[in-house]
């Protein structure tokens, strides 16, 4: 006998997690067999929709992989033409384990500003968000708060806020942790100890101290009368985010010395400055007819270059001539660290013999200058490129220190060995040998101003030089 459809198993509320299977059952008794249709939120579910599976003549509806958007009211309607259609409805509640959709990222922030670490979450039930700093739960206070969105806001960031953070999203279905991120607190550079001003005698040594701090640790640069310090020795040490810089100066003129501490914050820099003046008591420029005395060389820098027990001229215009001249050489040699292997030994020989000139003892001790030919050999053969660069820097005012100018002879002003062989000094390391003429390296492209000997490259301790003309 025909029988109107009766739903024997009404639809129930189904809870399902995202990506899980969800099944509604609508068991129907009727004769003949009914047509069963399904709706979601009153919209018909198409039987060919591959996201759904229908079994047992439509009595079982399965969502094969639940999505967030599947949430809603599902109804089955059974109709077999006998009596009216019957309907049963049930809800699908899409539950979702917590998911962090916008995790926190590493942040660098300047002390005193506001930091926000994002942590946006999804989940059903709505997850609660907490934060962990290091290994401990983070406590909220007047500066630190977890926003409704889950993000962490820190007002007036302090150094102690730096560290590792992660957010935790929790609901009844589970817990999600973000990756660990770093909050780095940067601090503007500031000077803790400024250099002190000094009034000293000409030729004195002065050490200027400058101490600075910041995060990251700042770098310290020294400025002399508005230009980068080109002479003097700088010693630096860093401890516990504090940098200590000491500038040792050989004073030949007054000046304003500025310590500049700089650190970088992203694309921007922060700087702090402190200045000190160096004045010279009864200062006047050193005269050309400086007096001095002969003494054996007792320094270290020119040991390998000057003849053993060589008598050198020590200039008494310096308070401590030996130390002052040694510092001049030392400073000049530091600049030679970057020159070519061909140039360096020749330049070292020239510098040492120029600053510690050979001394002619007598009633009036007299310095013997280097012969012009040797100076030109260094300038235009061994160190042609380097000399051009150095002269260019001098003209551009990059070498303001008189110490530097003192360390480089002007070849054209030196006496020639042709005028009076005893009036000028030869460089002992440039030993002339006519047989080596064919072994010289090619001359530089710049044409020499005078005939100069072609000198082959050699080790730092010995040169063989073949003249293009007689030097005897």
């Amino acid at each position: 006998l025909p029988k109107a459809p009766v739903i024997t198993t009404p639809l129930e509320t189904v809870d399902a997690l995202v990506e899980e299977v969800a099944t509604f059952m609508c068991a129907v008794e009727s004769y003949p067999q009914p047509e069963i249709s399904w709706t979601r939120n009153k919209i018909l579910i198409k039987l060919f929709d591959t996201r759904y599976s229908i079994r047992e003549n439509g009595q079982l509806l399965t969502i094969l992989s639940v999505e967030d958007s599947d949430d809603g009211i599902y109804c089955c309607t059974a109709n077999n033409g006998v009596g009216g259609a019957v309907e049963s409805c049930g809800a699908l509640q899409v539950k979702m384990k917590p998911k962090i959709t916008r995790p926190p990222i590493n942040v660098k922030i300047i002390e005193g500003l506001k930091a926000v670490l994002p942590c946006t979450t999804m989940g059903n039930p709505k997850p609660s968000v907490s934060w962990i700093k290091g290994d401990s739960p983070l406590r909220e206070n007047s500066r630190i708060a977890v926003l409704e969105s889950g993000s962490l806001r820190i007002h007036n960031v302090q150094k102690e806020d730096a560290g590792q953070y992660r957010c935790v999203a929790k609901n009844s279905l589970g817990t999600a942790y973000s990756k660990v991120v770093k909050l780095e607190v940067e601090v503007f550079a500031r000077i803790l100890r400024a250099p002190e001003s000094h009034n000293v005698t000409f030729g004195s040594f002065v050490t200027l101290h400058c101490t600075a701090t910041g995060i990251p640790v700042p770098t310290i640069t020294w400025i002399e009368n508005g230009n980068a310090v080109s002479s003097g020795s700088i010693q630096e040490s860093v401890k516990d985010r504090v940098i200590d810089s000491r500038l040792q100066l050989f004073i030949t003129k007054p000046g304003l010395y500025t310590c500049i501490a700089t650190n970088k914050h992203g694309e921007k820099f922060s700087t702090a400055k402190a200045a000190a003046t160096i004045s010279i008591a009864e200062w006047s420029k050193p005269q050309k007819d400086n007096k001095g005395y002969c003494a054996q060389y007792r320094g270290e820098v020119c040991n390998a270059v000057l003849a053993k027990d060589a008598l050198v001229f020590l200039n008494t215009s310096y308070a401590d001539p030996e130390e002052a001249q040694e510092l001049l050489v030392h400073t000049a040699w530091n600049e030679l660290k970057v020159v070519s292997p061909v140039c360096r030994p020749a330049a070292e020989a020239l510098l040492c013999n120029h600053i510690f000139q050979e001394c002619s003892p007598g009633v009036v001790p007299t310095p013997i200058p280097i012969c012009r030919e040797y100076c030109l050999a260094v300038k235009e053969l061994f160190c042609a490129k380097e000399w051009l660069v150095m002269e260019e820097k001098t003209h551009r005012g990059l070498y303001r220190s008189e110490m530097h100018l003192l360390s480089v002879p002007e070849c054209s002003k030196l006496p020639s060995m042709h005028w009076d062989p005893t009036a000028c000094a030869r460089l002992p390391h440039l030993d002339y040998n006519k047989e080596n003429l064919k072994t010289f390296p090619p001359m530089t492209s710049s044409k020499p101003s005078v005939d100069i000997p072609n000198l082959p490259s050699s080790s730092s301790s010995s040169f063989s030089v073949s003249p293009t003309y007689s030097m005897t």
């Epitope: 099944t23 047992e56 079982l60």
Partner: antibody, heavy 121, light 107 residues
């Protein structure tokens, strides 16, 4: 009395084909979902395929999809499983089972005795 | 696919004992779980369907319980014919799956 009898099993080389049949009696065949379940020697049960009472809703396990085809002939009260591209791991006893809708899902209330399929070179 | 995990994989018991076999689904499956018994050389036999309904003709010493993802088959007062392999199965998904089986042996 409900009866399900499988046939068509045997020895086949890898890559070969076989067609299993299941003859049903003792119930209204056209009113029930029918399934194939297999059991490798000494192993557990593995569901293979399912077909709705009218032959409209068909499902396969991932391991056989694309190689096996389930079908039915309600007029002959018969269920079939066409097996192509057979592999050694298809070696098993193949059972046909009747699906029954209950208050919570379906279950297999009647099973055949099984038909052994051996895939070996 | 929904995975069904049975425990233990085997257990020894004596006639008259009460034993329980557990089955855990990889997701909630409502009550769409069935239990089967298989003795050597025979086809499986339905014991329990819809988690707790006893199939007709099955002795009442067999009972099933559970809902969601955790299910249990209990045999109270083991009989010699009960020593067999037991399988759980879910039908919540159209791609139904079985547990790996629990072998019940005589101690």
């Amino acid at each position: 009395e409900v009866q399900l009898v499988e046939s068509g099993g045997g020895l086949v080389k890898p890559g070969g084909s076989l067609r299993l049949s299941c003859a049903a009696s003792g119930f209204t065949f056209s009113s029930y979902t029918m399934d194939w379940v297999r059991q490798a020697p000494g192993k557990g049960l593995e569901w293979v395929s399912s077909i709705g009472s009218n032959g409209d809703y068909i499902y396969y396990a991932d391991s056989v999809r694309g190689r096996f085809t389930i079908s039915r002939d309600n007029a002959k009260n018969s269920l079939y499983l066409q097996m192509n591209s057979l592999r050694p791991d298809d070696t098993a006893d193949y059972y046909c089972a009747r699906g029954q809708l209950a208050v919570a899902g379906t279950h297999f209330d009647y099973w055949g005795r099984g038909s052994l399929v051996t895939v070996s070179s | 696919d929904i995975q069904m995990t049975q425990s233990p994989s085997s257990l020894s018991a004596s006639v008259g004992d009460r034993v329980t076999i557990s089955c855990r689904a990889s997701q909630k499956v409502n009550k769409y779980v069935n239990w089967y018994q298989q003795t050597p050389g025979k086809a499986p036999r339905l014991l329990i369907y819809a988690a707790s309904t006893l199939q007709s003709g099955v002795p009442s010493r067999f009972s099933g319980s559970g809902s969601g993802a955790n299910f249990t088959l209990t045999i109270s007062g083991l009989q010699p014919e009960d020593f067999a392999i037991y399988f759980c199965q879910q039908s919540y998904s159209p791609l139904c799956t079985f547990g790996q089986g629990t072998k019940l042996e005589i101690k």
